[in-house]
């Protein structure tokens, strides 16, 4: 069983999923309002968003006293965060600016990918090896969407029997999408294109917030029970509370290299020939050069206009 990394508003913690009755280890303490969290295992980096400080920060998990600001301007409510461990990029949602953005892992070369028809975007999950990203939106028209990680091919994949879609996670091995709905109190799964939808846990969950997966087990945080729960990812059976008495459980991830499988990085050689951003894409050649917001990509499709 994995270590579970979760945000707890005031801190980030790690707890062993097999021994959740033990106290969790504080990875980073003294925080204001840590909401979303993710990591790049191979780089030893943990990222989180703080919705009160309106910032995204990071630390090296062997040097937890070294907290760095990554994005500190232009954020209002960065509810969702995801690291592209392959292309070495950071993606985030903001439910008040109504944007989905991307940058380098250090926060540089920031680009707005989506800014239209977003209401309350929240969870975001990446599948870098196929070039797709997924996100939930619990606004007036709740939905789950999929798009290329380069901002292409945007498509609504779930828009029925959905109300407050919060948690979202991908099963890379079985190519499945799992999500938790806090108002309809369930966990459902589907194919990555939204087809073949099935219930995993039927409407019995008080307020599931964030969702992760490791091997055959789903793990999620619940706002109402202030705990982390788990069940079998196929059947929903064995539903149990594995860690309780959490101050304010927010985002959660299975903290393991297994959750960030290696694959060929199409941007790996010379940044794909791109002058600035090289983003994963779902279509051949599986990457797309891009420029920071406000800067034009030249006709060669590789170079950003001077001044970026």
């Amino acid at each position: 069983a994995p270590l579970l990394l979760y945000a707890n508003r005031r801190d980030l913690r790690l707890v062993d999923a097999t021994n959740g009755k033990e106290n969790a280890t504080i990875v980073v303490g003294g925080l204001e309002d840590a909401a979303a969290v993710d990591f790049v295992f191979s780089h030893g980096l943990i990222y989180w968003s703080d919705v009160s400080e309106e910032a995204i920060k990071r630390t090296e998990f062997n040097k937890t006293e070294s907290v760095q600001n990554v994005v500190v301007s232009g954020l209002l409510s960065p509810d969702g965060l995801a690291c592209d461990w392959l292309g070495e990029k950071l993606y985030w949602t903001d439910s008040e600016t109504n944007r989905i953005e991307v940058s380098n892992l250090d926060g540089s070369l920031r680009k707005v990918l989506f800014w239209q028809e977003l209401d309350q975007p929240r969870a975001i999950a990446l599948d870098p090896s196929s070039g797709f990203m997924y996100w939930t939106d619990w606004g007036e028209v709740p939905k789950i969407e999929r798009a290329g990680m380069d901002g292409s091919s945007r498509f609504i994949i779930i828009n029925s029997e959905i109300y407050w879609p919060n948690g979202l996670t991908l099963d890379y091995e079985e190519q499945k999408l799992y999500w938790a709905d806090a108002k309809l109190n369930f966990i459902h799964k589907s194919n990555l294109d939204g087809t073949n939808r099935q219930a995993v846990v039927k409407g019995s969950l008080p307020h599931p917030f964030a969702l992760t997966l490791f091997e055959d087990i789903l793990y999620w945080t619940d706002w109402s029970t202030h705990s982390i729960l788990a069940c079998n990812k196929y059947t929903g059976e064995g539903l149990r509370e594995i860690h309780s008495d959490i101050f304010s459980p927010m985002d959660i991830h299975a903290f393991s290299q297994q959750r960030q499988p290696n694959a060929t990085n199409p941007c790996g050689i010379d940044n794909g020939g791109c002058s600035h951003l090289c983003l994963m894409s779902p279509v051949k050649p599986f990457y797309q050069c891009a420029c920071p917001t406000g800067v034009k990509l030249l006709e060669n499709g590789k170079t950003c206009k001077d001044g970026a």
Partner: antibody, heavy 123, light 108 residues
Framework: QVQLVESGGGLVQPGGSLRLSCAAS????????IHWVRQAPGKGLEWVSG????????HYADSVKGRFTISRDNSKNTLYLQMNSLRAEDTAVYYC????????????????WGQGTLVTVSS | DIELTQPPSVSVAPGQTARISCSGD??????VYWYQQKPGQAPVLVIY???KRPSGIPERFSGSNSGNTATLTISGTQAEDEADYYC???????????FGGGTKLTVL
């Protein structure tokens, strides 16, 4: 438009009971936390109690804990405050106020208020 | 819980800028909300999350929050702005609102 209408206030003797109601309209009641806030004559605002969107979570100010009970009926779009063992210092205008959307992470303010109902505790 | 302190009264001439302070230990670490209450009426939210204005609130209302003091600023104060103003904050864990004692704004 959002409307909150309180009722049930009146004159009651010390040690007595009263039940306040708040009828809501103009929004999806079951999506929001709702609160009671009171104001003693000539004094400031005091938060009294709050209840989560589903009713599963309730909170009380120390001054009313054990005496007041907040509840809601989402099928009737109505909030309640059962007040027992009333004291003279509970005399106030009681407002019901809409709190945060149930799925919001960090917003805890009261964006719409009713006009209030007066509770007078006196012998 | 943080204790919020406001001046009991502030006076301003019409058209001038009124500033109402709300102090509390490390208040910058909390979101601050401001409510306006006119005599015999219910409170109205005028500023949320330190500096954001709800729709329908005039642009002359603004807010800031740093150090140990949050400030509500009313630029070009009008007679209709005469009211009591309350600052408020809330703990991240639960929904208890904490209100300041209120400030009576008089427009001379």
């Amino acid at each position: 438009q959002v409307q909150l209408v309180e009722s049930g206030g009146g004159l009651v003797q010390p040690g007595g009971s009263l039940r306040l109601s708040c009828a809501a309209s103009g929004f999806t009641f079951s999506d929001y936390a709702i609160h009671w806030v009171r104001q003693a004559p000539g004094k400031g605002l005091e938060w009294v109690s709050g209840i989560s969107y589903s009713g599963s979570s309730t909170h009380y100010a120390d001054s009313v804990k054990g005496r007041f009970t907040i509840s809601r009926d989402n099928s009737k779009n109505t909030l309640y405050l059962q007040m027992n063992s009333l004291r003279a210092e509970d005399t106030a205008v009681y407002y019901c106020a809409r709190g945060s959307h149930g799925n919001i992470m960090a917003k805890r303010y009261f964006d719409f208020w009713g006009q209030g109902t007066l509770v007078t505790v006196s012998s | 819980d943080i204790e919020l302190t406001q001046p009991p009264s502030v006076s301003v001439a019409p058209g001038q800028t009124a500033r109402i302070s709300c102090s509390g230990d490390n208040i910058r670490k909390k979101y601050v909300y401001w409510y306006q209450q006119k005599p015999g009426q219910a409170p109205v939210l005028v500023i949320y999350e330190d500096s954001k204005r709800p729709s329908g609130i005039p642009e002359r209302f603004s807010g800031s929050n740093s150090g140990n003091t949050a400030t509500l600023t009313i630029s070009g104060t009008q007679a209709e702005d005469e009211a009591d103003y309350y600052c408020s904050t809330a703990d991240s864990g639960i929904n208890n609102g904490v209100f300041g004692g209120g400030t009576k704004l008089t427009v001379l």
